[in-house]
């Protein structure tokens, strides 16, 4: 978790002098409670936006927006703490809006935004806006939270971001798999424009089950430049196991930008359709 560029993070707006500060996620008011505290944020909204760094890289960011309730507690509002918690790593990053002037009611509702938290593809975050000072131990909570899911690199708008492109999102292998005679699979896919090796991972399953009955790994050496964007054809031999008929083919590239952590593509071959009508049973069974 990080902030996008540390260039001028602004929270000031007409009628309010405000500065954005790094935060330890443990505001002083948590340790030294105040008697009078503001109400909670209203209408917390989170959207996925995209922002360029000064180097020209494009990153997904969480655009956080909220408004203030129209009550007298804004007289005691000293700022806000924005917290983003990445759920799978438990990593948290916070910033603090510090109001340098008192808020006053004016003809339209106060609205705040912040768009500098960089988020990762296919990750879930808990986004919280806490009004400051925080409430006394038994006081009503004055924060709002939402669990925000960032699309993965298959998403059209995510595909062109720097983190997705680094993991190989622009490569479309267009995998085709066909079943041949004599327990063989023919796998065909388009190579990318990089001299790097690939791995084909074959996993086979029984018709309606999810535990594998056969696994095989096939190494494809790095193509020569004249082979870039060409189709690579590989024939895989299957184990002759009756009912081991559903095959998942996964292609793992090893691009220089993502090494062994590149996006994998897969295709599945289903089991052949079973005939609807069972074999007829004779009316009588001969004894000889």
């Amino acid at each position: 978790l990080r902030l996008l560029d540390h260039r001028a993070l602004v929270c000031s707006q007409p009628g309010l002098n405000c500065t954005v500060k790094n935060s330890t996620c443990l505001d002083d008011s948590w340790i030294h409670p105040r008697n009078l505290t503001p109400s909670s944020p209203k209408d917390l909204q989170i959207q996925l936006h995209f922002a360029h760094t000064q180097q020209g890289d494009l990153f997904p960011v969480a655009h956080i927006e909220w408004t203030l309730q129209t009550d007298a507690s804004i007289l005691y509002l000293e700022g806000a703490e924005l917290s983003v918690l990445q759920l799978n790593t438990n990593e948290r990053l916070c910033v603090r809006f510090e109001f340098l002037s008192k808020l006053r009611h004016h003809h339209r509702r106060w609205r705040f935004t912040f768009s500098h938290f960089v988020v990762d593809p296919d990750q879930e975050y808990e986004v919280t806006v806490h009004h400051l000072p925080k409430p006394i131990p038994d006081g009503d909570p004055n924060h709002q939270s939402k669990n925000f899911l960032v699309p993965d690199c298959e998403h059209a708008r995510m595909k062109v971001t720097t983190p997705c492109m680094s993991s190989g999102s622009l490569w479309d292998p267009n995998i085709t798999v066909e079943t041949l005679e004599a327990h063989q699979l023919r796998v065909s896919f388009t190579l990318w424009n990089e001299s790097t090796h690939y791995q084909i991972l074959l996993t086979s399953f029984p018709h309606m089950e999810n535990h594998s009955c056969f696994e095989h790994m096939h190494h494809i050496p790095a193509p020569r430049p004249e082979e870039f964007h060409q189709r690579s054809n590989v024939t895989l031999t299957l184990r002759n196991l009756k009912g081991c008929c559903r095959h998942q083919v996964q292609i793992q590239p090893f691009f220089s930008s993502c090494l062994n952590d590149c996006l994998r593509h897969s295709a599945t071959v289903s089991c052949p359709e079973m005939p609807d009508t069972p074999e007829p049973i004779p009316d009588y069974m001969p004894l000889w």
Epitope: I46, Q47, H49, A62, N147, F148, L149, P151, A156, R157
Partner: nanobody, 126 residues
Framework: EVQLVESGGELVEPGRSLRLSCAAS????????MHWVRQGPGKGQEWVSG????????DYADSVKGRFTISRDNAKNSLYLQMNSLRAEDTALYYC???????????????????WGQGTLVTVSS
Amino acid sequence: EVQLVESGGELVEPGRSLRLSCAASGFNFDEYAMHWVRQGPGKGQEWVSGISWNGDNVDYADSVKGRFTISRDNAKNSLYLQMNSLRAEDTALYYCAKEEGLGYCRGGSCSTFDYWGQGTLVTVSS
């Protein structure tokens, strides 16, 4: 021009099933989370269910959990709501709504809905 057109609403008996559809056009359907929202007679709007851009994540209001199933077909630009074990309290106008921003939030919407359909009427009565 963005359009959302719901269909499938009708009069059904309690305990029966119904499938609502929403045909979307005028925007990149496969980039946005979509939702079903309903408004019963004399009631306010109630969020029913939401689904992420690719259908991998779904959420439901407690009142419909276990009975309703939301799904989508991005190839057909369509959103669906399968409603089983219908009750009288499910009677409402059902709207399909597009999330304004990208991303998906658990248990509801991340941002406002910027486009709505005209609604399809579901009446559950014996």
